[in-house]
Interface confidence: low
């Protein structure tokens, strides 16, 4: 008699490791014998798909070479056209041993900075990764940790970082394990030791002596009044990753020597610098080796904060004075852009008259100083927070100003007004409440380097335009 | 006689790299600044990146950052412009061309490009 | 980014004219500005830098000015090889920027 179909053994998960074979087994009583289909994900499965075997009047669905995309639902239908239509349904789960899709690869990485170092697997079950740094197991903690794509990331990435690392995928198949790669931690170039200023005699020979440390390992270059050191001998050594070196000179004239300490990561350097003044005793006017000459001011950037007609000093060390100190000037004004309305005009009044100074006509044309008063003023009346955050911006190196040395003058150095009022210039524009310069205790001593108390600290107090490179 | 020779060009599909090479003869590259100024068919010049070969100084604009890497060897007088991830807009010419600096200061107020290269197009398409 | 508006970006001119390019900074740009003259399938050649100076080999008729942030390229009597694309540039802040060009074409 016909019969309708019935699904004796129903389908069942099957589990199965990728490039072995999977079988489902749908199992029909009928009569007439019926015609049975199978579909994966809904999806007809075509007889002549190479990629299955279907026996037994369609009973028996083998898959030959299973792969990891096998994965999904598999049902069968008989139909034998007595009575409705018959499905059995069961999962196919490919098991997977694991597999690292995505190693990790070297990396180079500025101390401070955040690393990624990559581990993206596959497998079934979802496999579990670890890191070996070295030789043992690597621990989280507040910095280190495994992501849940098993990449591993370190925050604020320190010197002991530095090693070789491998990631690990586990499951219940199988063991993968990474290639060893290598993380290497740079660290930007830093000033240790600083060279001291000195007050010397004419003819005196004096060591600067000049310390830094970085990865990899900064030169050091000395400048001489924003030149390269023309003379002197420079002595170097290396040891543990610092760099030692001193600068011997013979003192026939004042000078302002900076120590740059650079080093390289990929295309872009990191720099640190400090700097020392050397100056004469008893040395009142600048001698012949002063080159320059008095002019009146034709330049832009400072027209609103010169007086009119203001006569400068311009120094014939450049090819082109005006034009070079315009430029000074003008790549010290873009970085105060973004300073506060107060001190900005206070800051600009400040360059300019440091960059373009008033000058004193004669046999040998003179620069004149800014009054230290004045400069003070600047530094803790108007710009005192600002000028902290120029300093931190200079240490940390995030200007990206290429200049080698743009700087106001270290205040402290400068002449008081309480000792010669026609020695030292004043800052006309800088519209303070003459109350404030009384704050500053006048000065008694001859000595120029008493300081005024509570200055910021920093290894050099100039107020500078660093030569270096957001490391972005 | 100065010389700019740009070279590199060529089709790239998106997401892909080029590295343009601008061989300069007749002066020093370290003398001077390189810039890599480009020109999408049909339209104005766009600068795009500058060395400054004597301090290693780089600036790129806005629209490449990250993306392109400017850098010189002096030993072969010759700078580069690395180009990663490129895009259906960054076809164009591109031209290196030299600005003369006597002076060791930044770029920021200079007299203008005096020696261009020929130019070298890249295509950006799939 | 600084903008060069560059006026007008055509015009059509005869040889023997007197022709006018202006190019107005969106901000002081000091005399930090250079032109230059593009042909079809050539690179750029400077013609004026620092807004006024000629650079060398350019003839004479070829003038830069400034007035404030306006900057003007005039042309005293038009030739036919100065049948071209003219550009200003401004290279005092960064980025430096170009303005969109000027076609001057045969009228």
């Known amino acids: 008699l016909p019969k309708a179909p019935v699904i004796t053994t129903p389908l069942e998960t099957v589990d199965a490791l990728v490039e072995e074979v999977a079988t489902f087994m749908c199992a029909v009583e009928s009569y007439p014998q019926p015609e049975i289909s199978w579909t994966r994900n809904k999806i007809l499965i075509k007889l002549f798909d190479t990629r299955y075997s279907i026996r037994e009047n369609g009973q028996l669905l083998t898959i030959l070479s299973v792969e990891d995309s096998d994965d999904g639902i598999y049902c069968c239908t008989a139909n034998n056209g007595v009575g409705g239509a018959v499905e059995s349904c069961g999962a196919l789960q490919v098991k997977m041993k694991p597999k690292i899709t995505r190693p990790p690869i070297n990396v180079k990485i500025i101390e401070g900075l955040k690393a990624v170092l990559p581990c993206t697997t596959m497998g079934n079950p979802k496999p579990s990764v670890s890191w070996i740094k070295g030789d043992s197991p690597l621990r989280e903690n507040s910095r280190i940790a495994v992501l849940e794509s098993g990449s591993l990331r370190i925050h604020n990435v320190q010197k002991e970082d530095a090693g070789q690392y491998r990631c690990v995928a586990k499951n219940s198949l199988g063991t993968a394990y990474s290639k060893v790669v290598k993380l290497e931690v740079e660290v930007f170039a830093r000033i240790l030791r600083a060279p001291e200023s000195h007050n010397v005699t004419f003819g005196s020979f004096v060591t600067l002596h000049c310390t830094a440390t970085g990865i990899p390992v900064p030169t050091i270059t000395w400048i001489e009044n924003g030149n390269a050191v023309s003379s002197g001998s420079i002595q170097e050594s290396v040891k543990d990753r610092v760099i030692d070196s001193r600068l011997q000179l013979f003192i026939t004239k004042p000078g302002l020597y900076t120590c740059i300490a650079t080093n390289k990561h990929g295309e872009k350097f990191s720099t640190a610098k400090a700097a020392a003044t050397i100056s004469i005793a008893e040395w009142s006017k600048p001698q012949k080796d002063n080159k320059g000459y008095c002019a009146q001011y034709r330049g832009e950037v400072c027209n609103a904060v010169l007086a009119k007609d203001a006569l400068v000093f311009l120094n014939t060390s450049y090819a082109d004075p005006e034009e070079a100190q315009e430029l000074l000037v003008h790549t010290a004004w873009n970085e105060l852009k973004v300073v506060s309305p107060v001190c900005r005009p206070a800051a600009e009044a400040l360059l300019c008259n440091h960059i373009f100074q008033e000058c004193s006509p004669g046999v040998v044309p003179t620069p004149i100083p800014i009054c230290r008063e004045y400069c003070l003023a600047v530094k803790e009346l108007f710009c005192a927070k600002e000028w902290l955050v120029m300093e931190e911006k200079t240490h940390r190196g995030l200007y990206r100003s290429e200049m080698h040395l743009l700087s106001v003058p270290e205040c402290s150095k400068l002449p008081s007004m309480h000792w010669d009022p026609t020695a030292c210039a004043r800052l006309p524009h800088l519209d303070y409440n003459k109350e404030n310069l009384k704050t500053f205790p006048p000065m008694t001593s001859s000595k120029p380097s008493v300081d005024i108390p509570n200055l910021p600290s920093s290894s050099s107090s100039s107020f500078s335009v660093s030569p270096t490179y957001s490391m972005t | 006689e100065v010389q700019l020779v740009e070279s590199g060009g060529g089709l790239v599909q998106p997401g892909g790299s080029l590295r343009l090479s601008c061989a300069a003869s007749?002066?020093?590259?370290?003398?001077?600044?390189i810039h890599w100024v480009r020109q999408a068919p049909g339209k104005g010049l766009e600068w795009v990146a500058s060395i400054s070969s004597s301090s290693g100084y780089t600036s790129y604009a806005d629209s490449v950052k990250g993306r392109f890497t400017i850098s010189a060897d002096t030993s072969k007088n010759t700078a580069y412009l690395q180009m990663n991830s490129l895009r259906a807009e960054d076809t164009a010419v591109y031209y290196c061309?030299?600005?003369?600096?006597?002076?060791?200061?930044?770029?920021?107020?200079?007299?203008?490009?005096?020696?261009w290269g020929q130019g070298t197009l890249v295509t950006v398409s799939s | 980014d600084i903008q060069m508006t560059q006026s007008p970006s055509s015009l059509s001119a005869s040889v023997g004219d007197r022709v006018t390019i202006t190019c107005r900074a969106s901000?002081?740009?000091?005399?930090?500005v250079a032109w230059y003259q593009q042909k079809p399938g050539k690179a750029p050649k400077l013609l004026i830098y620092?807004?006024?100076s000629l650079y060398s080999g350019v003839p004479s008729r070829f003038s830069g000015s400034r007035s404030g942030t306006d900057f003007t390229l005039t042309i005293s009597s038009l030739q036919p090889e100065d049948f071209a694309t003219y550009y200003c540039q401004q290279s005092y802040w960064w980025p430096i920027t170009f303005g969109q060009g000027t076609k001057v074409e045969i009228k």
């Open positions: 007749g002066f020093t590259i370290s003398s001077s600044s």
């Open positions: 061309a030299r600005k003369y600096s006597k002076r060791a200061y930044p770029d920021y107020y200079w007299r203008g490009l005096d020696y």
């Open positions: 901000q002081s740009v000091s005399s930090a």
């Open positions: 620092s807004a006024s």
